[in-house]
Every structure is written in structure tokens, then in C-alpha cells.
């Protein structure tokens, strides 16, 4: 028998520095977690103690903090090289800055293979990107070889900016021939490493003949056997065992997100490459694990540029950006309009001739807006200003909801109107009229939404049974501010970009902004 240790991360999302337990900015260092310096300590400890170790990443290193905003992926290549990753799969967020934003900082700089079998380049891009990412890689590990085959969510064109010269194929269809090829090369230990979410990970384990282990990402799935060490609730045991269609027991793993855990899986193979046993657990990277001093020093060196960036001008406003609680928790506010416009703009994807865009709607809890920006400061807007407006370090996510769920959400928005509570919704691509003289739960008298399947966008009444795409803060997707109906009834949820980054990118793009209050939210006569 031959034993392999798989160490794995996924959805790190730019958490190079240690974070608080909830993966936001580290406040009390003695209780902080994760970060590449601490990860390196644990990885090195395992490498010293065990003979056959692979360190793998299942995608979405890009996007999530000011590190990515400033360094645009160069930080990912640098620190993953320093940690000596063995392989990485492409995630959807790796395409956030377009293909060029993937090629230059990461693909050309990485000293480890970057993989995806279901992304096919065409046209002029095919020769430019050739060899920079691979469908699979055979890695020598001790006296043996292990095949790693990559995959990426086929939804990436809707979630990021891969452009028109990359085709995202069905994962299972694309993986099978690559696995077959590895088999003909006498590689009998094969890991599928990819970024399509836990449901797809399980399907790959079930359907792709010859895959021995699946290491996944995208869904931030936490698996654990026994008593979990922090607040994440396990979605199942680690590893999660899937019985394949040809009768094999295939372990599937994922390690939550944000570099909080290091996945640790031990696999025992027989001489024919069959999995005999698999066991392990994610390792919580808490403060009992010291940060490696050399990596930490490097982080501190790279950090300097971030502090300078915070005070640089991103763009200008020629109007007062009203982010006061007096406005945003009671009525339409132009700061809410600005943020929602930025959220929609960040999700412009012309993927189908029938649609001007795949999503037109945004909702945003007024309580999430925490500061105005005064135009009398020469109109200057900085990252620092935006961090005061959006201080909680969230993401703007894409969800799919039925019209009936949206109606409930808008009723919830005003169910206790007048108490300066945070659930009052700011909107984009939506016209809503409330009648506050009616009883709570029956106050939405008009709800029109901007069409997507149209060449000239116009507002149509919301249909209860139709499924709509909506951009919203992850806080709302998770049921925050009492929006339990969103959490309970959402049909799909894909995590998006860092909130401040979305707004800062929009302001930089527009250069000068002047958002207005324009009648997106109205109160019918006699009620307000």
C-alpha cells in the first residue's frame, strides 16, 4: 500500500493576512486565524512529518480584499509560489479582470501547474494562452506519480469576465476523455481538482470513471468528522464518500473558504491504484499555529502599498452622496442608487443575443450603508471613504429567486417601517410603490422589474412564478436583517466580488458620478 497526504485550500479570496474568526479584518490578533504565513507553518510541519504530500488549491484565490484590488493577482502568484503549491484549478473569480488579468499576473508567473479540462480556448486567444493552463498534470510524488485533472464552473461566463474566446464545457463530458488519457499513460492514481461546487463534485465522483479523489471548491462547503472546532456547521463528514456508478467508494473533500482551514486528507492506495482507505479532517488555522516569520515579513513588505492606495483618488462626485440612516433606512437614497448601479454594472455579461444582460435587478439593505460622502471635499472619493460606507467586508452575490420570494422580501422591507431599521431596501432595476396605511405584509402595491430578455429595457410587473436573477449583499443571501425568506427560498447562490471593490471599480470607470433620487421607491398618496 502507498499513502498520499492531500493538503488543500479553496475559495481563499485574497485572505493573505490573518483574519478574524468570521474571515473579516483581524482585530484581536490573539484570536485571529488563517493567512498565508500561518498556512505555511502548518504545511511545512506536515511536509517534514509525512513522505508523500501534495498541496492543492481548488480555485478562487482572486477577489475579496484590497490585496486583490491593488495587486491584481500578482500577490496570488508570489505567495502561492512561496508556499510551493503543487497545483491549482481555475475558479470563476480568476477571470474577474478578464483573460489578460489572469494570464499576465498569474498564469505566466506561477511556478506550479494551473488546470482546467473543461475550458477550451478558441480564435486568437488559443495560441496566446496555449500551455499556460493545462487540462491535467502528472506529478511525481515520492516513487509514484499522481494525475491531477482540473475543472471550472461552466457558469463562469455569467459570474465573471472570461470573454468570448473561452468556451466552458460540461465538466463531466470534458473530464472523462482526460482521465481516460491519463489511464493510457499508466497513471492509476487520479485526483479531480476543481471549482464547480459540492453538488458537481459529487456528480464527478459518481460519473467520471477513473477518478479516485475529488478536491473541490466554489460552494464554500465545510465537511468535518467529529466535533467541529469553530462555528462552521458541517454539511457532511470529511471525507464525503460517494459510491461511483462503477461501484467504487470515492472520497470528496472541500475546505470551507478564506484560508481558515487547511484540508488534510490521507489516502491509502493499493498497488493497482485503488483507494483502500481515506480519512482526515480540515485543520483549523487558529492562533495556536504561529505565523511563519519569513512569510510574515514578506506580507508586511507587500502591505505598505495597500496603505498608500487607501487615500488615492478613485474618481469624483459632483453631488452629495447621501448615505445617512435618516435617508437610506426610510426612503430612496442616492448612495443606495449608486451602489446598486455599481452592482449591476459589475455583472454586465453579454452572453446571449436574446438578452441585453443576464441580470437587471439589485436589492441592498439600507442598514448596510454606513456613511455619506460629501462632495465639498473637491469631490474626491477614496477607498477609505468607501470603506466607511461599506465597513463590513461583504460581497455582492448573484442569486436566483422566484417572484413570490421577492414580493415577500419587499413586504419585509417595510413591515415595521419608521423605526430606522436596516431592512429597508434600496434598489436597482426595480420600481416599488408602498402603501404604509395598509397592514404589514400587504404594503407593496406595485412592483415592476426591468426586463432582461429585451433589446430595449423596460419595466414590467413582477410575475410570482417566474425565476429572476438578483444581485444582493451576501448578508441578505444568508438571511440577514430578517430576510429569512431569501435564505430559505433561493434557488441558486453564487458568491460575488468584494463590495468595496465593486463600487470603487465603478467609480474609477465612470470618473465623475452624479447619482440622483429618481423614483425607484415611492409611497402612495396618503401613506407617507
Amino acid at each position: 500500500a502507498w499513502e498520499l497526504t492531500i493538503l488543500h485550500t479553496n475559495d481563499v479570496h485574497s485572505r493573505l493576512e490573518q483574519t478574524s474568526e468570521d474571515s473579516s479584518k483581524c482585530v484581536n490578533a490573539s484570536r485571529c486565524m488563517g493567512g498565508v504565513a500561518r498556512l505555511f507553518t502548518k504545511v511545512q510541519q506536515i511536509r517534514r512529518a509525512e513522505p508523500n504530500v501534495l498541496l492543492l488549491d481548488a480555485g478562487d484565490q482572486y477577489q475579496g480584499t484590497i490585496w486583490f484590488t491593488v495587486y491584481k493577482g500578482a500577490e496570488v502568484a508570489h505567495f502561492m509560489n512561496a508556499l510551493r503549491y503543487d497545483a491549482m484549478a481555475l475558479g470563476n473569480h480568476e477571470f474577474d479582470n478578464g483573460v489578460e488579468g489572469l494570464i499576465e499576473p498569474l498564469l505566466k508567473e506561477a511556478k506550479f501547474p494551473i488546470l482546467s479540462a473543461n475550458i477550451k480556448a478558441k480564435g486568437p486567444l488559443a495560441s496566446q494562452i496555449s500551455g499556460l493552463y493545462l487540462p491535467y498534470k502528472v506529478l511525481p510524488v515520492g516513487d509514484e506519480v499522481v494525475g491531477i485533472v482540473g475543472y471550472t464552473s461552466k457558469e463562469t461566463p455569467f459570474l465573471s469576465n472570461p470573454g468570448t474566446n473561452l468556451v466552458f464545457e460540461d465538466e463531466i463530458t470534458a473530464l472523462q476523455p482526460e482521465v481516460d488519457k491519463l489511464k493510457t499513460l499508466n497513471v492509476n492514481k487520479i485526483i479531480a481538482l476543481g471549482h464547480s461546487g459540492f453538488e458537481m463534485d459529487k456528480l464527478i465522483a459518481q460519473k467520471v470513471r477513473g477518478v479516485d479523489v475529488v478536491v473541490g471548491g466554489h460552494s464554500n462547503t465545510f465537511l468535518y468528522t467529529g466535533n467541529p472546532p469553530s462555528k462552521e456547521v458541517p454539511a457532511g463528514k470529511y471525507p464525503f464518500i460517494v459510491t461511483s456508478d462503477d461501484g467504487r467508494k470515492v472520497p470528496v473533500v472541500q475546505a470551507y473558504a478564506f484560508g481558515k482551514y487547511l484540508g488534510y486528507l490521507k489516502i491509502e492506495f493499493d498497488e493497482r491504484g485503488n483507494v483502500i482507505s481515506s480519512h482526515g479532517n480540515p485543520i483549523l488555522l487558529n492562533s495556536s499555529i504561529p505565523e511563519d516569520p519569513s512569510i510574515k515579513a514578506d506580507i508586511n513588505k507587500w502591505r505598505i502599498k495597500l496603505d498608500n492606495y487607501s487615500t488615492q483618488e478613485l474618481g469624483k462626485t459632483i453631488v452629495y452622496l447621501d448615505g445617512s440612516s435618516q435617508s437610506c433606512r426610510f426612503r430612496e437614497c442616492n448612495m443606495g442608487n449608486l451602489i446598486c448601479d455599481a452592482m449591476i454594472n459589475n455583472n454586465l455579461r453579454h452572453t446571449d443575443e436574446m438578452f441585453w444582460n443576464h441580470v437587471s435587478m439589485c436589492i441592498l439593505n439600507g442598514g448596510g450603508i454606513r456613511s455619506p460622502i460629501d462632495e465639498r471635499n473637491n469631490g474626491t472619493i477614496t477607498w477609505e471613504n468607501l470603506a466607511a460606507v461599506l465597513p463590513f467586508g461583504g460581497t455582492f452575490d448573484l442569486v436566483q429567486l422566484k417572484g413570490s420570494t421577492l414580493k415577500k422580501a419587499f413586504e419585509h422591507s417595510v413591515h415595521r417601517y419608521g423605526q430606522s431599521t436596516g431592512e429597508f431596501l434600496q434598489v436597482g432595476g426595480i420600481h416599488v410603490v408602498y402603501d404604509l396605511s395598509r397592514k404589514p405584509g400587504d404594503r407593496v402595491v406595485k412592483l415592476d422589474v426591468l426586463c432582461t430578455k429585451c433589446r430595449v429595457p423596460s419595466y414590467d410587473p413582477l410575475k410570482m412564478d417566474e425565476v429572476y436573477k438578483v444581485i444582493l449583499p451576501n448578508f441578505l443571501a444568508n438571511g440577514g436583517d430578517g430576510f429569512q425568506m431569501i435564505k430559505d427560498e433561493l434557488l441558486r447562490h453564487d458568491s460575488g466580488d468584494q463590495d468595496i471593490n465593486v463600487v470603487s471599480t465603478y467609480i474609477s470607470k465612470m470618473k465623475v458620478i452624479y447619482p440622483a433620487v429618481e423614483g425607484r421607491i415611492k409611497f402612495s398618496t396618503g401613506s407617507h
Epitope: 435618516q326 415595521r416 438571511g479 430578517g482
Partner: antibody
């Protein structure tokens, strides 16, 4: 994150007192702030809240018209002006960030004793 | 909105499963939090939004309920869990329950 209350002490019925809460380690100006009190050997009683930008204030019925909450975001400070104090206002007074939410932090409290 | 907690005191042993209930005088959706307080200390948030575990709180604590009836469960009591527990609604101006004192049997 640190919240440090001060200004407590002994005061006669009908008298006044001003409590302060000094905040550090977080973006004070981004958080709604509360005062909560606890009479000796008794349970918790919410007193007042002020929104992050100072534009909204709410009070418990038991203190309405007598207590005033205020803040100075430039100084990272929260205040509670207490007038017309009564014996039943005797309590440990805590300042806290957005209670019952993810960003929930409390100070260690300051004791106010109203007695003749 | 009044909050009624029960029981007002409770004796239990290490390893026991303990349940504390809280009833609101009217529907409060999931606007409910649970706090733990030890003598001479500030309250510590355990659960918010009825069932969401606060950062750093052990997973043996869990919350459930919606509307008017809510429950705090400690799956296996540890020595450090003996304290007073309060529920608190934030649907309207905040209001705390009267507290449940959890003592060693």
C-alpha cells in the same frame, strides 16, 4: 475592540450625571450604539440607542424625557446625559455596539448609585 | 413587546443537555438573540437572528424558533456554561427576558 465606560458614581435623587464611553479598535462611526443597564441582582434593561450618524435616537419608556444619548464620532465617544435621577436608576450601565447582531461588543460597565 | 423566559432557574450537571425557552408577547420573526452573563461580567452574545452562532461561540450552543417561541439548547453542558442566560428581541425597541439562572446540580 474596546469600550470603556466612565462617569458613574454616587448621586442624589433628582441629580444629574453624564456617562461616557470611549471606543477603540473598530470604526466607531460605522456602528449604531446602545446603552443597557442592570440593577443590582436584577436582569438586563435596554436604555437607549443612537444610529451610527447620530440622526436617529430611541429610548426606553422608563427614561424618556430624562436621559439623552449623544455621540461624537470624531472622538470615538458615546455619551448618556442622565437628569432627574431616581433610586430605580441605580444600576451598572453598559455601552454596547449593535446589540443582537454580528458586530456585538460590550464594555465592562460603570456603576451609578442614586441615593440620599 | 414583552419577553418571557422559562424556567427562571435550572439545575443541571456537566454533560447534560439543557433547553431554555423564550416566548414573545407578539410575533418577532427571527429578531431574537441569546446572551450569557457571568457574575460581575458584561453579557456575551451567543446567538443572533434566532439561530446564527456568534463568532467564537462553541457549537454545543444552538438556537431555534421563529415568530413567538424560541429555544436555546446547550447539547452537552461544560463547567464554564454555568451562568445566567437572557433572550432579547430587537423587532421593536430592544427588550430582554428576565433571565434563566443555570446552576450546578
Amino acid at each position: 475592540v474596546q469600550l470603556v465606560e466612565s462617569g458613574g458614581g454616587l448621586v442624589q435623587p433628582g441629580g444629574s450625571l453624564r456617562l461616557s464611553c470611549a471606543a477603540s479598535g473598530f470604526t466607531f462611526s460605522s456602528y449604531d450604539m446602545h446603552w443597557v443597564r442592570q440593577a443590582p441582582g436584577k436582569g438586563l434593561e435596554w436604555v437607549a440607542v443612537m444610529s451610527y450618524d447620530g440622526s436617529n435616537k430611541y429610548y426606553a419608556d422608563s427614561v424618556k424625557g430624562r436621559f439623552t444619548i449623544s455621540r461624537d464620532n470624531s472622538k470615538n465617544a458615546l455619551y448618556l446625559q442622565m437628569n432627574s435621577l431616581r433610586a430605580e436608576d441605580t444600576a451598572v450601565y453598559y455601552c454596547a455596539t449593535e446589540i443582537a447582531a454580528k458586530g456585538d461588543y460590550w464594555g465592562q460597565g460603570t456603576l451609578v448609585t442614586v441615593s440620599s | 413587546i414583552q419577553m418571557t423566559q422559562s424556567p427562571s432557574s435550572l439545575s443541571a450537571s456537566v454533560g447534560d443537555r439543557v433547553t431554555i425557552t423564550c416566548r414573545a408577547s407578539q410575533g418577532i420573526s427571527n429578531y431574537l438573540a441569546w446572551y450569557q452573563q457571568k457574575p460581575g461580567k458584561a453579557p456575551k452574545l451567543l446567538i443572533y437572528a434566532a439561530s446564527t452562532l456568534q463568532s467564537g461561540v462553541p457549537s454545543r450552543f444552538s438556537g431555534s424558533g421563529s415568530g413567538t417561541d424560541f429555544t436555546l439548547t446547550i447539547s452537552s453542558l461544560q463547567p464554564e456554561d454555568f451562568a445566567t442566560y437572557y433572550c432579547q428581541q430587537s423587532y421593536s425597541t430592544p427588550h430582554f427576558g428576565q433571565g434563566t439562572r443555570l446552576e450546578i446540580k
